[in-house]
């Protein structure tokens, strides 16, 4: 763009240098050249000479008119054709911008990822504005009435150290640019209600060699939250439909979940958790791929063992002893057997 230019005259824009996209725009050029009575005044947009809709107003001034200007940015300059000069003489230049006032920020969400030390707030900014738009996040304590303000673009991370004076806050986002200002709806936040447990990870899976083979999936989390509700979704890599199991988890122990799956098939597993009774979920864990073993001997595959048949939900605890060459320490492992149902509206879909 034209940031600094020594003008021999003036250039101005109506309605202004930043205007709403699609508006009609007039750009004026007024020369103040010494020793020049210009034959012609010329306009250039982004370096290209304009041919149409130019009006010479008087000896020193000309105007170019644009109907429905819709370019986000343009670099305008004007020149004079001075008698006796081989080249045109520069008069002045301006950067112009068109855009939109901001939409009201929507879908404002604030969460605290366990151990992160931050409250992360995100929102939808709406349609592009094409011009510099600031987002101001207001965080107001409902107990002390004090307000903090943060500059952001589409999300903000606020240190929980700065939120120690209170547990309850009102959060809203203000979108501001030179064409307008809009506020999001206010979000009531209780810091204890927005914690998302530390990431859940599937560590391994194995398929037993039983008469009816079962697949055991092992998974864990470093969360310190006692009551956690989780979902594990799974499907063959060739399938589009997920099945989901739901269960309560206690991460004092490694979790063990049992599945009766099709033999000789490649399955994808993902898990996510939330604090029981709260609304914010972890993102789905990284996809874990497991190949079930081949069917041994000829056996009719029982319909109840299909992953897509509804099964009764049940959580059991299983005590297992370590192998004989290890110290005889008993370890409690949680095993789950329960209903499968197709999942819909999930993110991070695989295959």
């Amino acid at each position: 763009g034209i940031t600094s230019i020594n003008c021999s005259g003036d250039m101005w824009v109506e309605p202004g240098e930043i205007f709403q996209m699609g508006m009609n725009v007039s750009i004026y050029c007024q020369e103040a050249l010494k020793h020049c009575r210009p034959r012609n005044l010329y306009f250039y947009k982004n370096g290209f000479k304009e041919e149409f809709d130019i009006t010479r107003i008087n000896r020193t001034t000309a105007r170019i008119w644009y109907k429905g200007f819709s370019e986000p940015h343009a670099y305008m300059h004007c020149t004079a054709e001075c008698p006796g000069h081989f080249q045109e003489t520069l008069i002045c230049g301006k950067d112009i911008s068109s855009g939109h006032p901001p939409d009201a920020p929507s879908n404002l969400t604030c969460v605290i990822y366990e151990y992160s030390g931050n409250m992360t707030c995100t929102w939808n900014t709406g349609k592009p504005t094409y011009i510099d738009t600031k987002y101001i996040v207001h965080v107001k304590s409902l107990e002390t009435e004090e307000e903090q303000q943060y500059l952001a673009s589409s999300y903000v991370k606020i240190s929980t150290d700065s939120l120690q004076g209170s547990r309850k806050y009102l959060v809203w986002v203000q979108a501001v640019n030179s064409l307008g200002m809009e506020n999001s709806q206010q979000l009531h936040v209780h810091l204890d209600d927005i914690v998302i447990p530390s990431a859940s990870i599937i560590s391994r899976a194995e398929t037993t060699n039983d008469t009816v083979p079962k697949t055991i999936v092992y998974w864990k989390s470093k969360t310190m939250i006692e009551k956690v509700f989780c979902e594990m979704r799974y499907k063959t890599t060739t399938n589009q439909t997920w099945s989901v199991k739901e269960f309560d988890a206690n991460f004092t122990y490694v979790q063990q979940s049992e599945f009766y799956l099709e033999p000789d098939s490649k399955y994808v597993f993902q898990v996510r958790c939330q604090e029981t009774g709260k609304r914010n979920w972890q993102p789905w864990s990284s996809p874990f791929v497991h190949q079930t073993s081949q069917e041994t001997g000829k056996r009719n595959w029982q319909p109840w063992s299909s992953p897509f048949v509804h099964q009764t939900s049940q959580t059991v605890s299983q005590v297992t002893a370590k192998s004989s060459h290890e110290p005889q320490k008993m370890e409690m492992l949680s095993a789950t057997i329960f209903r499968g149902h197709p999942a819909s509206g999930n993110h991070q879909d695989i295959g």
Epitope: K134, E147, Y150, L151, S162, G165, Q174
Partner: nanobody, 118 residues
Framework: QVQLQESGGGLVQPGGSLRLSCATS????????MTWVRQAPGKGLDWVSG???????VYADSVKGRFTISKDNAKNTLYLQMNSLKTEDTAVYYC????????????TGQGTQVTVSS
């Protein structure tokens, strides 16, 4: 109640430097967003620089690269270091709570006069 007191203004030659201070009380300064605004003779209030609650700074195009805003939370004081001053920086400078946009800032001080002249 919020109290703001600006100081550090004066007469300086073009190209010179000044450091403005704003002593504050009556609110939690360390977690508050703050702004410097100025009023040139015969003109309205214009924002100069802002610092948000997390320490992110922002500057008006006209002062970018020349002015620096900072906070000393231990002293509850806001600063504006002004270098390479120009005659067009002549104005009364005010500090304010809040950020520069969206009618969020409030000022209570008397301001400090900065005059840049040769």
């Amino acid at each position: 109640q919020v109290q703001l007191q600006e100081s550090g203004g004066g007469l300086v030659q073009p190209g010179g430097s000044l450091r403005l201070s704003c002593a504050t009380s009556g609110f939690t300064f360390s977690s508050s967003a703050m702004t410097w605004v100025r009023q040139a003779p015969g003109k309205g209030l214009d924002w100069v620089s802002g610092i948000d609650s997390g320490g992110t700074t922002v500057y008006a195009d006209s002062v970018k690269g020349r002015f620096t805003i900072s906070k000393d939370n231990a002293k509850n004081t806001l600063y504006l270091q002004m270098n390479s001053l120009k005659t067009e920086d002549t104005a009364v400078y005010y500090c304010a709570t809040g950020l520069p946009w969206g009618n969020t800032w409030r000022t209570t001080g008397q301001g400090t006069q900065v005059t840049v002249s040769s």
